[in-house]
Interface confidence: medium
């Protein structure tokens, strides 16, 4: 009883691995809310309405010192920084459509502003943010960002932004409807980390009482059983899934989109979290306001074949 | 604290240029932009521009495109304000000031910075 | 732009009483997601300006509760309840809704 066995240790370590995970997660990843661009690439018609789709992902707080600035711009590729330069959307600069609203609200340009350029953005308590683009027209085509501030207090702002292309075509080139692309796998693992962090911070308070009675259990089988038997249980235990979690559907979706089929993206790691500046002491911007709530987007992964949805 | 310390006075010629600096503290200077005001005693605060230091994104008013040029170091954490083509109507007072979105104002304020155009 | 203008330009009085100053706007200041972003700051004698107000009615951290705002679309006020000898200076409205923001040209408030 003195030397522990090769159960014993190897379910202790089990145990502790899955215990500092809940730790970990208890304590909150220091990167606070993403944004995801479900689709990196809009192919629309002349004449077509399209929505173009951001999605906070993460913890998202909806307490009352909470307040989101949300909105929209043009801007060009650059070679270091996408989405530095704020362009007008038709004439409308990002300061025009921007929405500043509480965590626990949705909100909307007004509907005069919609009516005179074609245009709405609107932002629903399930983390969606998206912008309403009517009668496309080839000025219309070029890079769009969506750009979410999270001020806290007075003294913490937290801005990221997401960017995707719209291709307005004419001719008989051009599809009969809006064909959407979707992010690639890796823009994908990238925006997800934050909703892996959440739903790991989830599943450990969930599994900790199942943890231990299993760390405590196992710990008791270990001194009763043979060395063959302990052999066989660590492989049984070394065969173990993670605990999955499932991706919801997004409660809003694009209007306009006709989904073929329902977009599901299984993780397969978790990447080091890279980019700007995700928690910030004070900050003030050039940019917009909005709410969310904590939402794992679906997002698939290119394959080799181009992925594509007709909308 | 939130701090912005501007550069000292300048007395510049005609048509010459200057370059004005504010040095951001107490805060990170990435998360938020600074924008720049001038202040004379005929046309009292106006409102030049700003910039978001982590990208470099500019903003002008339209009254001083071609007269301001605005620029950030991130790794001093300060900002900079170039006049050029000065003439004496350029002579007043420039503050840098941090845009805060939670107000959607001008939040903090430089001590302000004099610029005086004479021959 | 938005022409921002003050009434009175200069408003005497004396410690203790309440003061009360008005900014109207050129066009409304509600923004297309109805929040109006109408702001107040305060510029002591030889000093940058400091936020007071901002979004009609918030009293920016630090500001004491004697200093109000109110009203809505073009024509707001500014009011302090007790005038205190700190409270002097050149008090500025300014907006936000439309670019480029813009400044009203200030009420001096002094002492009568």
């Known amino acids: 009883m003195g030397v522990p066995t090769a159960l014993e240790a190897g379910s202790w370590r089990w145990g502790s691995l899955l215990f500092a995970l809940f730790l970990a997660a208890s304590l909150g990843p220091v990167a606070a809310f993403k944004v995801a661009t479900p689709y990196s690439l809009y192919v629309c018609p002349e004449g077509q309405n399209v929505t173009l789709t951001c999605r906070l992902l993460g913890p998202v707080d909806k307490g009352h010192d909470v307040t989101f600035y949300k909105t929209w711009y043009r801007s060009s590729r650059g070679e270091v920084q996408t989405c530095s330069e704020r362009r007008p959307i038709r004439n409308l600069t990002f300061q025009d459509l921007h929405l500043h609203h509480g965590g626990h609200q949705a909100a909307n340009t007004s509907h005069d502003l919609a009516q005179r350029h074609g245009l709405e953005s609107a932002s629903d308590h399930h983390g969606n943010f998206s912008i309403t683009m009517r009668n496309l027209t080839l000025l219309d085509s070029g890079l769009y960002c969506c750009l979410v501030v999270e001020i806290r207090h007075h003294h913490s702002e937290h801005r990221v932004h997401g960017a995707m292309e719209l291709q307005v075509q004419t001719g008989k080139d051009a599809p009969s409807n809006c064909v959407v692309y979707p992010s690639s796998s890796q823009d994908s693992e990238n925006i997800t980390a934050a909703a892996l962090a959440t739903g790991a911070c989830i599943v450990g308070i969930l599994c900790l009482p199942l943890i231990l009675l299993l760390v405590y259990k196992q710990r008791q089988a270990a001194s009763n059983r043979r060395a063959q038997e302990l052999v066989r249980m660590d492989s049984n235990i070394q065969g173990i899934e993670n605990p999955g979690f499932e991706a919801s559907p997004p409660a809003q979706g694009i209007p306009e989109a006709k989904v073929r089929h329902p977009l599901s993206y299984v993780a397969q790691r978790q990447p080091s979290e890279s980019g700007r500046h995700l928690l910030s002491e004070p900050s003030t911007p050039l940019s917009p306001p909005g709410p969310g709530d904590v939402f794992f987007p679906s997002l698939d992964p290119v394959p080799d074949s181009p992925n594509f949805e007709v909308i | 604290q939130v701090q912005l310390q501007q550069s000292g006075a300048e007395l510049v010629r005609p048509g010459a240029s200057v370059t004005l600096s504010c040095k951001a503290s107490?805060?990170?200077?990435?998360?938020?932009?600074m924008h720049w005001v001038k202040q004379t005693p005929v046309h009292g605060l106006e409102w030049i521009g700003a910039?978001?230091?982590?990208?470099?994104?500019?903003a002008y008013n339209q009254k001083f495109k071609g007269k301001a040029t605005l620029t950030a170091d991130k790794s001093s954490s300060t900002a900079y304000m170039e006049l050029r083509s000065l003439t004496s109507e350029d002579s007043a007072v420039y503050y840098c000031?941090?845009?805060?979105?939670?107000?959607?104002?001008?939040?903090?304020w430089g001590q302000g910075t004099s610029v005086t155009v004479s021959s | 732009d938005v022409v921002m203008t003050h009434t009175p330009l200069s408003l005497p009085v004396s410690l203790g009483d309440q003061a009360s100053i008005s900014c109207r706007s050129s066009?409304?200041?509600?923004?297309?997601?109805?929040?109006?972003?109408l702001h107040w700051y305060l510029q002591k004698p030889g000093q940058s300006p400091k936020l007071l107000i901002y979004?009609?009615?918030n009293r920016f951290s630090g500001v004491p509760d004697r200093f109000s705002g109110s009203g809505s679309g073009t024509d707001f006020t500014l009011k302090i309840s007790r005038v205190e000898a700190e409270d002097l200076g050149l008090y500025f409205c300014?907006?936000?809704?439309?670019?480029?923001?813009?400044f009203g040209g200030g009420t001096k408030l002094e002492i009568k």
């Open positions: 000031t941090r845009w805060s979105l939670r107000p959607y104002a001008m939040d903090y």
């Open positions: 107490g805060y990170t200077f990435t998360d938020y932009e």
């Open positions: 910039i978001d230091p982590e990208t470099g994104g500019t």
């Open positions: 066009q409304s200041l509600v923004h297309n997601n109805g929040n109006t972003y």
């Open positions: 979004k009609v009615s």
């Open positions: 300014s907006q936000s809704t439309h670019v480029p923001w813009t």
